[in-house]
């Protein structure tokens, strides 16, 4: 049975040209993490975070996007077409599969309306 | 063109140890990790761990964690995986291959280590 | 750990046939699988990735398609140099392969 739940940092908008965390958290489940994938708006993988082979990050994204803060991904030079879902799957044993949603606005303004806990400045 | 060009056969006693090398060329060594997996006979392909060049950091499975040690000479483009306490379990072809984000795009020919008394 | 089983495990064509191998998952592989074709005392080559993207170099007559839990590879004209064992892998929940199928000559 899957006890667990998944929280993300929702609907979340950063400033073109700056950088964001992606973050989602698993709780209320003992379930052990074996994988954690994130994957973009066009359900396209961007990385992966296997619990024994570490950080595995798709070629073309190498050089915008960094693993970590923990389980997170951290988009840096942010384009307007980095505006959409992005998706975490928890892969977990013995639970199964737990799915995170956020919704990232990319603003072409100076001012970014985002919680300051999930923002690089 | 991209080429892993792995070390000969080796035939070891049980309880050796066995260091096969994986040369690597035709690419920038540092920009992808190396992996080492093995296929024993009639048994299915298994991944044992990983180097990343850049840092020399590695990851292992479990399964591999306590026997198996990776290392790169990056200044000659290698990567080396030595397997130790060997068994006969451990007779198998042994693999270097690139990844290339999330699968391998290149293999070495694969080295064979037969474990035997 | 997502395991793999392909079908069948043997498989006897003639040259010109049309061959197609399954590879089936405990788990949805969301897409996420590869094909690799092996000859003997050789390196496993890349033939497909993501499910249907053909590898660069690799011949059209090789294509991939499936979605959820089953797989398939298909040969649509089989070559003399098509003869190997081809294995399926996917990374969607570990990194695992298929324990292969060997085409031989019938």
């Known amino acids: 049975m899957m006890t667990g739940t998944i929280e993300t940092t929702g609907n979340i908008s950063a400033k073109k040209g700056g950088s964001v965390i992606l973050q989602c958290h698993l709780s209320s489940t003992m379930a052990q993490v074996t994988q954690v994938n994130w994957e973009q708006h066009d359900h396209s993988l961007l990385a992966i975070r296997n619990a024994e082979l570490g950080w595995h990050i798709y070629p073309a994204f190498k050089d915008r996007v960094a693993p970590g803060p923990g389980l997170g991904l951290t988009l840096q030079s942010l384009t307007m077409n980095d505006t959409g879902e992005y998706f975490c799957t928890y892969h977990t044993y013995p639970d199964g599969t737990y799915r995170g949603r956020i919704f990232l606005e990319v603003l072409e303004s100076s001012v970014a309306e985002h919680s300051a806990r999930f923002q690089i400045p | 063109e991209v080429q892993l060009v792995q070390s000969g056969a080796e035939v070891k006693k049980p309880g050796a140890s066995v260091k096969v090398s994986c040369k690597a060329s035709?690419?920038?060594?540092?920009?992808?990790?190396i992996y080492w997996l093995r296929q024993a006979p009639g048994q299915r392909l298994e991944i044992m761990g990983r180097?990343?060049?850049?840092?020399?950091?590695?990851y292992f499975v479990d399964k591999f964690k306590n026997r198996a040690t990776i290392t790169t000479d990056t200044s000659a483009s290698t990567a080396y995986m030595e397997l130790s306490s060997l068994r006969s379990e451990d007779t198998a072809v042994y693999y270097c291959a690139r990844i290339d984000g999330f699968y391998f795009d290149f293999w070495g020919q694969g080295t064979l280590v037969t474990v035997s008394s | 750990d997502i395991q793999l089983t392909q079908s069948p495990s043997f498989l006897s064509a003639s040259v010109g046939d049309r061959v197609t191998i399954t590879c089936k998952g405990s788990q949805n592989v969301n897409k996420y699988l590869v094909w690799y074709q092996q000859k003997p005392g050789k390196a496993p080559k890349l033939l497909i990735y993501?499910?249907?993207n053909l590898q660069s170099g690799v011949p059209s007559r090789f294509s991939g398609s499936g979605s959820g839990t089953e797989y398939t590879l298909t040969i649509s004209s089989l070559q003399p140099e098509d003869f190997a064992t081809y294995y399926c892998?996917?990374?969607?929940?570990?990194?695992?392969f298929g324990q292969g199928t060997k085409v031989e000559i019938k």
């Open positions: 180097i990343d060049p850049k840092n020399g950091r590695t």
């Open positions: 993501s499910t249907d």
């Open positions: 035709g690419y920038t060594f540092t920009e992808h990790s």
């Open positions: 892998y996917q990374y969607n929940n570990g990194f695992t």
